[in-house]
């Protein structure tokens, strides 16, 4: 019997300080570049080694970024979202949604969780 895949969704506020090479991650998504079907949200596609986000350790590839410094990222064009990050200043507050994949096995087996990429 195959297990069912469920997702545990959590939100977190992450405060980053822009490093010498910036925040150190890439994004995909936006109203003109949907990354997830029927979702124009902004997602983290890559975290760069030794960048501010990597050194902080909380932001993960696959996370959805809900807001930057309190500004909602809903219904933004991709480039407008990029510009928002680039102009966000030295101290950057991100509201993010983590999506943890939880494998529910047959009855009597414990589920196993691993971050989705």
């Amino acid at each position: 019997m195959n297990g069912r895949v469920d997702y545990l969704v959590t939100e977190e506020e992450i405060n980053l300080t822009r490093g010498p090479s910036g925040l150190g991650f890439n994004i995909v998504g936006g109203t003109d570049q949907q990354y997830v079907s029927n979702d124009s949200g902004i997602y983290v596609s890559r975290i760069k080694e030794n960048g501010a986000a990597a050194l902080d350790g909380r932001l993960q590839e696959g996370d959805k970024i809900l807001s930057v410094n309190g500004q909602d990222l809903k219904n933004l064009l991709h480039q407008d979202a990029v510009d928002l990050f680039r102009n966000a200043g030295y101290a950057v507050s991100l509201r993010v949604q983590h999506r943890l994949q939880v494998q529910n096995g047959p009855i009597g087996h414990r589920g196993e969780g691993d971050p989705s990429g």
């Epitope: 890559r46 760069k48 990029v82």
Partner: nanobody, 127 residues
């Protein structure tokens, strides 16, 4: 992942024009930032031009500004580099490069280390 194949490089005379192409595999080409780099013998790989996923934002290296023009056709999964007023110092192997999404930091798309996918290169020689 995306595979990149450059074409169009050849021997030309100073002052001539040339157009390079970069064909990409994969269905998600329109979500990649794309760039052109070049490498002359004995020199480091140098940023030439870059384009945002949509093609709306374009950046150029100082040495090619006003002479080279980058463009992309997301329907054809292809990027181009129109090179005008070529000079002998433009002689190099030209590489097409890509990375998924957009980097959120100013100047990040000028850096070789930012790009995850590279073509094999095409030789441009200006005599």
């Amino acid at each position: 992942d995306v595979q990149l194949v450059e074409s169009g490089g050849r021997l030309v005379q100073a002052g001539d024009s040339l157009k390079l192409s970069c064909a990409a595999s994969g269905r998600t080409f329109s979500t990649y930032t794309m760039g052109w780099f070049r490498q002359a013998p004995g020199k480091e790989r140098e940023f030439v031009a870059g384009t945002s996923p949509s093609g709306d934002n374009r950046n150029y290296g100082d040495s090619v500004k006003g002479r080279f023009s980058i463009s992309r056709d997301n329907a054809r999964n292809t990027m181009y580099l129109q090179m005008n007023s070529l000079k002998p110092e433009d002689t190099a192997v030209y590489f097409c490069a890509a990375f998924r999404g957009s980097c959120v930091d100013y100047g990040c798309d000028f850096r070789v280390s930012q790009y995850d996918y590279w073509g094999q290169g095409t030789q441009v020689t200006v005599s």
